[in-house]
Interface confidence: medium
């Protein structure tokens, strides 16, 4: 009888679909080649497919195989019209595997899923589960066409790790899972605000998010001109206020307020303020004489336009008299004054339409 | 079926103490945060103490009003969950639940409630 | 703190009927980012612990029967039940879960004329 060929050995790739069948050749000498025979065990739908090699192979490979399907393999030695017991095994081609799933589009209520679609026909769709992690019953579960490559799942909960599974569907079968872990992000805060605006302070306040577990809110500000020179303040999650104080005066300041629930941090809430222009400084008065002074000051530290400065008798209640230097100037001599008057003096800096708080002096001729 | 059942109820004159407890079954008790509310005679819901799992360091929760009188803890192994009340008042008198916290999230309500346990503060 | 206020107090009616009663909270409940309502509604049954019925303002618990709904969004929400039955008869409460403390409403005592 002819010996049938030995160690068979089969291989289904579930990328691309093909079944590699290998083998050792057969002892007979002078034969004619090898029969290959793929079919379905126990009467299943699916194709019964067929090879013939020659003598000096020892492997072949079919395509077209429905994964997840048993077929049995055989290979017979055959010489002429004459063949061999077969050597057998069997097989079930796996179900094709995501391979590159990602997520995308994270937030406190949602995850975006993405992937490649599998290029097989026996392929019917996806379906896709989510789990808490640590728990073990899907809270989600659905199901998308063969050829959907991106969804959202949606009616999350904040700062929650997920466990969210992709599974290749096939009639009557499933690949394996894909599973991915993932957090939602932590909730961000809501409702920025600035008020109390002073030249090197300001509040800022903003309405906490729902979470009775935070673990602290991060308050990040810098000047707009310079945000690497960043300062951070850790705030008690009870709180949801604070005062940034030794601020630069006349300067825009970017403000971002997160949340952090353990350690993890929810996107900035941003804002922008400037704070205030702050007064000029040191008034002092040279010079007088009976109907002339000069008033004299140092400069704010903010950048400013000029200065606008006022005077006036102390017991005066008309409208007093205004002059106006550029920011280059810090004096000013007042003339065609009363002799023997005590005048009150007030300088503000001005940038543009922005003024400072009073600067007030009193000098008499 | 989840089942909260507490005991250690009681009579108690004020500025005393007492511990209430909680046994916690059909449930994976270890991942859960769980709660004490209480019930004044004749009057609404107030909640009491909160105690998170051990993956979230055990941290605790007090309402005002029993902050640095009582302590909530709890003991995994046994499915347990305790009250430790000190310093009892008069208006401390109230039915206290056991209660399991609802939901896999940083948000919560009281999905499971037990049948409660009576304290009385009285000379 | 979240003050929470419950109307009316005590409300009869008669079986058959349909009932609504209103919460309202000092603050909002409803949180920007997911469009939630973080406001639960329980049911105290005379000598029973309390049960939950609404979470999320909106969402029934499971085993509950579909003729409780609660609606509203923001500060002001109802509790309705569409035909009351003889078991409905209790006291209804309303808790927010928006920030600590947790607070609820003093309740609603339903009664049958």
């Known amino acids: 009888p002819l010996s049938p060929p030995t160690n068979l050995h089969l291989e289904a790739n579930p990328d691309t679909g093909v079944l590699t069948v290998s083998w050792e050749r057969s002892t007979t000498p002078d034969i004619t080649g090898y029969r290959i025979t793929t079919t379905p065990t126990n009467g299943q739908q699916g194709n019964s497919l067929e090879e013939v090699v020659h003598a000096d192979q020892s492997s072949c490979t079919f395509d077209n195989l429905s994964p997840g399907l048993e077929y049995n393999v055989s290979v017979y030695t055959v010489k002429d019209d004459k063949e061999s017991v077969p050597i057998s095994d069997t097989i079930i081609p796996e179900v094709p595997q995501l391979t590159d799933l990602s997520f995308v589009d994270i937030t406190d209520s949602s995850i975006g899923l993405r992937w490649t679609p599998l290029n097989s026909s026996t392929i019917i769709g996806y379906r896709i589960t989510v789990v808490a992690a640590g728990e073990g019953i899907p809270i989600f579960e659905d199901f998308v066409d063969s050829s959907v490559g991106y969804y959202t799942v949606t009616g999350l909960e904040p700062g929650i790790d997920y466990d969210i599974s992709v599974i290749t569907l096939i009639n009557g079968g499933e690949s394996a899972p894909t599973t991915l872990t993932q957090q939602t992000a932590v909730p961000p805060p809501t409702d920025l605000r600035f008020t109390n605006i002073g030249p090197d302070t300001m509040r800022v306040t903003w309405a906490p998010p729902p979470s009775i577990d935070l673990t602290n809110f991060l308050v990040r500000y810098s000047p707009v001109k310079n945000e690497e020179d960043v300062a951070e303040l850790s705030i008690s999650p009870s709180d949801n206020a604070v005062v940034l104080t030794n601020l630069l005066p006349g300067t825009e300041y970017v403000v971002s307020v997160s949340s952090v629930y353990e350690q993890h941090e929810s996107t900035p809430l941003r804002g922008r303020q400037k704070t205030g222009l702050d007064s000029p400084t040191g008034i002092d008065f040279s010079d007088i004489t009976a109907n002339s002074f000069t008033v004299h000051w140092i400069a704010p530290r903010a950048t400013i336009t000029g200065y606008r400065i006022r005077h006036h008798p102390e017991h005066f209640s008309g409208r007093p008299r205004e002059d106006r230097v550029p920011h280059s100037r810090n004096s000013i001599t007042l003339t065609n004054l009363t002799p023997g008057t005590e005048y009150v003096v007030s300088i503000v800096a001005l940038n543009g339409r922005e003024e400072s708080p009073l600067l007030i002096g009193q000098q008499s001729t | 079926e989840v089942q909260l059942v507490e005991s250690g109820g009681g009579l108690v004159q004020p500025k005393g103490s007492l511990k209430i407890s909680c046994a916690a079954s059909?449930?994976?008790?270890?991942?859960?945060?769980m709660n004490w509310v209480r019930q004044a005679p004749r009057k609404g819901l107030e909640w009491v103490a909160r105690i998170r799992s051990k993956s979230n360091n055990y941290a605790t929760y007090y309402a005002d009003s029993v902050k640095d009188r009582f302590t909530i803890s709890r003991d995994d192994s046994q499915s347990m969950l305790y009250l430790q009340m000190n310093n009892l008042k008069t208006e401390d008198t109230a039915m206290y639940y056991c209660?399991?916290?609802?939901?896999?999230?940083?948000?919560?309500?009281?999905?499971?409630w037990g049948a409660g346990t009576t304290v009385t503060v009285s000379e | 703190d979240i003050v929470m206020s419950q109307s009316p107090s005590s409300l009869a009616v008669s079986v058959g009927e349909k009932v609504t009663m209103s919460c309202k909270s000092s603050?909002?409940?409803?949180?920007?980012?997911?469009?939630?309502?973080?406001l639960a509604w329980y049911q105290q049954r005379p000598g029973q612990s309390p049960k939950l019925l609404i979470y999320?303002?909106?969402t029934g618990e499971s085993g509950v029967p579909d003729r409780f709904t609660g609606s509203g969004s923001g500060t002001d929400f109802t509790l309705t039940i569409s035909s009351v039955k003889a078991e409905d008869l209790a006291v209804y409460y309303c808790?927010?879960?928006?920030?600590?403390?947790?607070?609820f409403g003093a309740g609603t005592k339903l009664e049958l004329k």
């Open positions: 808790q927010q879960y928006y920030s600590y403390p947790l607070t």
């Open positions: 209660v399991k916290q609802g939901g896999n999230s940083l948000y919560w309500y009281f999905d499971v």
């Open positions: 603050q909002s409940l409803l949180y920007s980012s997911n469009q939630k309502n973080y």
């Open positions: 999320w303002a909106s």
């Open positions: 059909g449930l994976t008790f270890n991942t859960y945060a």
